[in-house]
């Protein structure tokens, strides 16, 4: 805590500029007006303040805004954001996506800190849902963000936001998460034509039920084996040999290489040998 001392003559700051880096901590406390700092926050990042000096500047803002900083200040915090605690951030009301982006940029390339996690939670709660633009922003900074949400949290993602999801954003999702995301994707892409629909829905198919796989088999989609292997076993088991053949198209030959692995192994065991023989792959049920 910096002691309250009078500002030496001629040292009163008229603006936030480079000369302040030569001020001692007590001089910053005494000579920099908090309201001036708040209006010129955008200048702070251009000045190479020490961590100790930044502590003083934060203390001044805390005194000026005990109930939490206004968004006009938050947007220009820059590296001062790294000094904030989750408790500080819980007092904020961040509504602008530009503000969120500015603060995420400060933390870019680092692991998601408790501060960033709190900021994101506050922002999403403030918006009421994880809308497309927010999801777009978050996955750009944190590619694993979507798959870090619990199924319950994912249930509040509106189908329209699914348009922001790239295949790689789903890389680390587990089957329970895909169970939640798949129906949303199905709804989001429902007006697309067959081949375009399949390209979009493909990454989500780990959550697809049997009836949807049956429907896809009627559309000449030529599903690759990598996608087929990620399907729910319980969804694959009821499919007939003819349906799997139609679903995979030319990729059906890949079943032989996967015959010992789920879901192919379990599916083979459910089929009549006569039906398997029609594939000409030497699969043994």
């Amino acid at each position: 805590e910096v002691e309250k001392t009078a500002c030496p003559s001629g040292k009163k700051a008229r603006e936030i500029d480079e000369s302040l880096i030569f001020y001692k901590k007590w001089e910053l406390e005494a000579c920099v007006d908090a309201a001036l700092l708040a209006t010129q926050m955008d200048r702070v990042n251009a000045i190479p303040f020490t961590y100790e000096q930044l502590d003083v500047l934060k203390h001044k803002l805390d005194e000026l805004y005990p109930q939490g900083y206004p968004e006009s200040v938050i947007q220009h915090l820059g590296y001062l954001f790294l000094k904030m605690s989750p408790e500080d951030i819980r007092k904020w009301n961040v509504t602008s996506l530009e503000t969120l982006k500015a603060l995420l940029e400060v933390n870019k390339g680092h692991e998601m800190s408790p501060q960033v996690a709190t900021l994101i939670d506050r922002f999403v709660k403030g918006r009421g849902q994880l809308d497309k633009d927010t999801l777009d922003t978050l996955t750009a900074f944190y590619p694993g963000y979507l798959c870090s949400l619990s199924p319950e949290e994912l249930s509040s993602v509106p189908p329209s936001s699914i348009w922001a999801v790239r295949p790689q954003d789903l890389d680390t999702c587990d089957p329970r998460q895909l169970d939640v995301l798949y129906p949303k994707a199905r709804l989001a892409f429902q007006n697309m034509n067959g081949s375009e629909y399949f390209v979009k829905i493909q990454s989500f198919l780990g959550g697809a039920p049997t009836e949807d796989l049956k429907a896809l088999s009627q559309q000449n989609v030529s599903m690759d084996l990598a996608t087929f292997m990620k399907l729910r076993t319980d969804a694959v088991l009821p499919l007939t040999v003819a349906e799997v053949q139609k679903l995979l198209g030319p990729h059906v030959e890949g079943l032989k290489a996967e015959e010992r692995h789920r879901p192919v192994r379990d599916w083979i065991l459910r089929q009549r040998q006569d039906d398997l023989d029609t594939l000409g792959l030497g699969l043994q049920g």
């Epitope: 692991e111 998601m112 694993g144 870090s148 949400l149 619990s150 680390t172």
Partner: nanobody, 116 residues
Framework: QVHLMESGGGSVQAGGSLRLSCARS????????MRWYRQAPGSEREFVSA???????AYADSVKGRFTMSQDDAKNTVYLQMNSVKPEDTAMYYC??????????WGQGTQVTVSS
């Protein structure tokens, strides 16, 4: 360097119980999801359970009601309590860490063998 270490595997009779542990180190903080997977001989790795950053859990249908995943944040450890085990639960069990940044890490695995 992120490191995961599983322990607690072993042999158990069908109907018995086992508790697996997975201790993590090298992660200061991230929006964390921890998962258990298992791999039986000649099979692909399959999802068993997850515990998400909000503390909620999810399970594969094959273990639901029998297995329980929990965590001890103070010890940076997650657990898999396996009850009413079946011979088909025999597998190598792996824990996996995922951070929102995209960071992923796997443990070396611990063997569970269930005899009838």
């Amino acid at each position: 360097q992120v490191h995961l270490m599983e322990s607690g595997g072993g042999s158990v009779q069908a109907g018995g119980s086992l508790r697996l542990s997975c201790a993590r180190s090298g992660v200061t903080y991230c929006r964390l999801t921890m998962r258990w997977y298992r791999q039986a001989p000649g099979s692909e790795r399959e999802f068993v359970s997850a515990i998400y950053s909000d503390g909620s859990t999810a399970y594969a249908d094959s273990v639901k009601g029998r297995f329980t995943m929990s965590q001890d944040d103070a010890k940076n450890t997650v657990y898999l309590q396996m009850n009413s085990v079946k011979p088909e639960d025999t597998a190598m069990y792996y824990c996996k860490l995922n951070c929102a940044s995209g960071l992923t890490a796997w443990g070396q695995g611990t063997q569970v063998t269930v005899s009838s």
